[in-house]
Every structure is written in structure tokens, then in C-alpha cells.
């Protein structure tokens, strides 16, 4: 089951997943000047069996013009605010090659991918929070959030983290205390702030299916 909304926003903090549960989707997007190949997928999917998980439907980009555009484009600040994503950073070797059962590691970069990644999480996914540079973490409890299903609705637990404006940078909790959580060890040092903005589906008491929230008309 996909999580209906985004993980909670904490002032002056970002979040990331150390591993992605099977069923997680990642938007296939290309940087400016490139597009998905015609037969390519809209999404990559974390899929697998009892012993191995991997990303299915690899994303592929091709030049959208005759002349290749190789300049890396940084999203405008207002775009970054809307998407709630950060730029991709150079991935390092995963700390632990053996993934959690039922989880995928951070997908490797694909050629000419967009500067940010947007994930669609599933129930049971855990994300970890850290304060942005220039802010220090005050922990009141776990600096993590889990997508849970309650009474047929999905919700994210509230991370117990406050970021204060002192010139120190905190670590991800998993990097401080690897034993704190089964997902505590980072699969990759790729820092991807991930999100899935979503519609709030309107439901009717009498209806068994979700009601349509789209209207179509002539221009």
C-alpha cells in the first residue's frame, strides 16, 4: 500500500531512507535537455522475492534535441520548495552490500538523470532526519518517521527532533548508532531527500470506490 502523504516536515531538517521497501516507486526523470526513451518507464519499482530485492524497469534518458545538452541544471529555489527535494550528491560505495530483506538499496545514478529524485513510499517505510548544515540536533527521541496504516489510512509517525541554530552539523542517527534500528546502516551515502506529494482523495460514505477528483473539459 502506497503512503498517501509525505513524511513530516521538521524545520531546518531533511530526511532520507537508508533502504527502500519493496513496492517503493521512483520517478524516472531526466535533466533538462533530455527525456525518457520512448519505450522507457515512468517509474522504477523496488521488487523482489524472499532472497533478493532490486529495482525493476530501469530509467533511461535520451537527448531531446539533436545536440546533446550536458550542462547540469539546478532546480530553481521555488521548484525545490515545491518538490521538497535536494540535489543529488555523488554516491559512495554502500556501507553494507547485503540489503535488508525485502528492501532495495539506493538505485545507482542513470545517465543524464534529473538533479532530484522523487520516491513514492509504501507502508512500513522508515526515513531518517538530520539537521541541515548550520543547525544542531536536539533529540527528544528517535529522529525517524515510519509510514503506518491506521484504520485503513496511512500516516507518518512524528520524529522527535528539534534543530537549533548553532553552527554544528548532526549526523543521521543511523550513522551515530548503527545498532539503533534494523535499518540503521546506510545503504549508500547518496543524500536524496525524497517525497511523494499526493492528492487528498475525497471519499463518500456510501461509495466503495474513491470518488473522481479530475474534471475534464474543452479548452
Amino acid at each position: 500500500e502506497l503512503c498517501d502523504d509525505d513524511p513530516p516536515e521538521i524545520p531546518h531538517a531533511t530526511f532520507k531512507a537508508m533502504a527502500y521497501k519493496e513496492g517503493t516507486m521512483l520517478n524516472c526523470e531526466c535533466k533538462r535537455g533530455f527525456r525518457r526513451i520512448k519505450s522507457g518507464s515512468l517509474y522504477m519499482l523496488c521488487t523482489g522475492n524472499s532472497s533478493h530485492s532490486s529495482w525493476d524497469n530501469q530509467c533511461q534518458c535520451t537527448s531531446s534535441a539533436t545536440r546533446n545538452t550536458t550542462k547540469q541544471v539546478t532546480p530553481q529555489p521555488e521548484e525545490q520548495k515545491e518538490r521538497k527535494t535536494t540535489e543529488m550528491q555523488s554516491p559512495m560505495q554502500p556501507v553494507d552490500q547485503a540489503s535488508l530483506p525485502g528492501h532495495c538499496r539506493e538505485p545507482p545514478p542513470w545517465e543524464n538523470e534529473a538533479t532530484e529524485r522523487i520516491y513514492h513510499f509504501v507502508v512500513g517505510q522508515m526515513v531518517y532526519y538530520q539537521c541541515v548544515q548550520g543547525y544542531r540536533a536536539l533529540h527528544r527521541g528517535p529522529a525517524e518517521s515510519v509510514c503506518k496504516m491506521t484504520h485503513g489510512k496511512t500516516r507518518w509517525t512524528q520524529p522527535q527532533l528539534i534543530c537549533t541554530g548553532e553552527m554544528e552539523t548532526s549526523q543521521f542517527p543511523g550513522e551515530e548508532k548503527p545498532q539503533a534500528s534494523p535499518e540503521g546502516r546506510p545503504e549508500s551515502e547518496t543524500s536524496c531527500l525524497v517525497t511523494t506529494t499526493d492528492f487528498q482523495i475525497q471519499t463518500e460514505m456510501a461509495a466503495t470506490m474513491e470518488t473522481s477528483i479530475f474534471t475534464t473539459e474543452y479548452q
Epitope: 520517478n27 518538490r83 534529473a114 511523494t196 492528492f199 482523495i201 475525497q202 474513491e210
Partner: antibody, heavy 105, light 107 residues
Framework: PGSSVKVSCKAS????????ISWVRQAPGQGLEWMGG????????NYAQKFQGRVTITADKSTSTAYMELSSLRSEDTAVYYC???????????WGQGTTVTVSS | DVWMTQSPSFLSASVGDRVTITCRAS??????LVWYKQKPGKAPDLLIY???TLQSGVPSRFSGSGSGTDFTLTISSLQPEDFATYYC?????????FGPGTKVEIK
């Protein structure tokens, strides 16, 4: 025949999604036909080969609206055109009510 | 392109009957299969995704199975509101093709 039509699809009840919006058409008495899709947050579209060059799918994040423009219309384009939120592996879970386009001389 | 076929095209059944509709893909699509139900004059409704996972709010009398190229939609006990046309769709690769549909009519 020969003209163009632009159908709009407005999302309400929430923010414009980072999921895809797909366009599907259905000719009278016929089945469903996927035309193409777009992820509004990025604005890049994919099209079925059958419609390549004739269809343009766009999205306006500021108005939470997706558009499908079909050009060089012919009588066989007479159909109901639907937009839907497309979650890929998880299917198209929310659909518009459909817009009937009739091409006649 | 991946081509989808459905059988039967038409099906006459009575309330309470067990109904099975099959869908076949021209090439392997793993479990990237979705089922929809459509009533005349209405937009389709999502029934099942990932070949066998019931969409939220869909009655448990509906079930899906299969993987690779052969898939099945089963209605364990047909209800009056189930008389409709059912479509399968592969979401494995572009274009996301639909099956031609199976119309379930009242006997």
C-alpha cells in the same frame, strides 16, 4: 476533420501530484486505449506510438491542470477522452468523468 | 508493444455465480497487471493492481492471480452491481496496453 482539440483535466482536493497523469480514450462501443502520460512536477511526457506527432500532453502546476491536445482530427478520433492519475504498477486509481469529442464534417 | 488478449469476450451469468476472466500478455510482464471494471457511461474503476492486490474499498469477492503471461480475475459470487465490462492492462512497458474487455451480462 483536420482541426485540433485541447482537453483539460483539473485536479482538486489537494496539491498537484508527482504521480503521472495518463490520458485514455474510448471510442463508442470500443475498449480503452492508452494515449500517453506526463508527470506534472517535471513536465515530460510519453506517448503511444500510434499518436506520436499528433498528440501533445502538457501540465500546468500553477493551476493543477493537465492538457491533452490532439491535432489533425479524423472521424475515428470520435471518443470519450479520460484523464487519470497513473501510479504505474499500482494502476490508475482516480479518473476524470471523461470528455466526449465528436469529429464530424 | 505488449499485446493483451482477454477471454471470453462476453459472459452470461447469474447472481451468485462464480465468474473467471482470463487475460494473456504477448510477452512476460511479471506481475505488472491491473484490472478495471467499467459501467456504461462511466469512467473505469480500479479493482486490482500488481496482478493480485485488491484496491482499497473493493469487495473481497474479487481476486486476481497470475504472473508472467497468464492472469485471471475471479468474482467468487456475482452481485447485481458486478454486471459490467472488465479490462486488464499491462503496466510493464510503454505503451500501457489494455485488453479488449470482457462484458459480463445477466443470464
Amino acid at each position: 476533420p483536420g482541426s485540433s482539440v485541447k482537453v483539460s483535466c483539473k485536479a482538486s482536493g489537494g496539491t498537484f501530484s508527482s504521480y503521472a497523469i495518463s490520458w485514455v480514450r474510448q471510442a463508442p462501443g470500443q475498449g480503452l486505449e492508452w494515449m500517453g502520460g506526463i508527470i506534472p512536477i517535471f513536465g515530460t511526457a510519453n506517448y503511444a506510438q500510434k499518436f506520436q506527432g499528433r498528440v501533445t500532453i502538457t501540465a500546468d502546476k500553477s493551476t493543477s491542470t493537465a492538457y491533452m491536445e490532439l491535432s489533425s482530427l479524423r472521424s475515428e478520433d470520435t471518443a470519450v477522452y479520460y484523464c487519470a492519475r497513473d501510479k504505474g504498477y499500482y494502476g490508475m486509481d482516480v479518473w476524470g468523468q471523461g470528455t466526449t469529442v465528436t469529429v464530424s464534417s | 508493444d505488449v499485446w493483451m488478449t482477454q477471454s471470453p469476450s462476453f459472459l452470461s451469468a447469474s447472481v451468485g455465480d462464480r465468474v473467471t476472466i482470463t487475460c494473456r500478455a504477448s510477452q512476460g510482464i511479471n506481475s505488472y497487471l491491473v484490472w478495471y471494471k467499467q459501467k456504461p457511461g462511466k469512467a473505469p474503476d480500479l479493482l486490482i493492481y500488481a496482478a493480485s492486490t485488491l484496491q482499497s474499498g473493493v469487495p473481497s469477492r474479487f481476486s486476481g492471480s497470475g504472473s508472467g503471461t497468464d492472469f485471471t480475475l475471479t468474482i467468487s459470487s456475482l452481485q447485481p452491481e458486478d454486471f459490467a465490462t472488465y479490462y486488464c492492462q499491462q503496466v510493464h512497458s510503454f505503451p500501457f496496453t489494455f485488453g479488449p474487455g470482457t462484458k459480463v451480462e445477466i443470464k
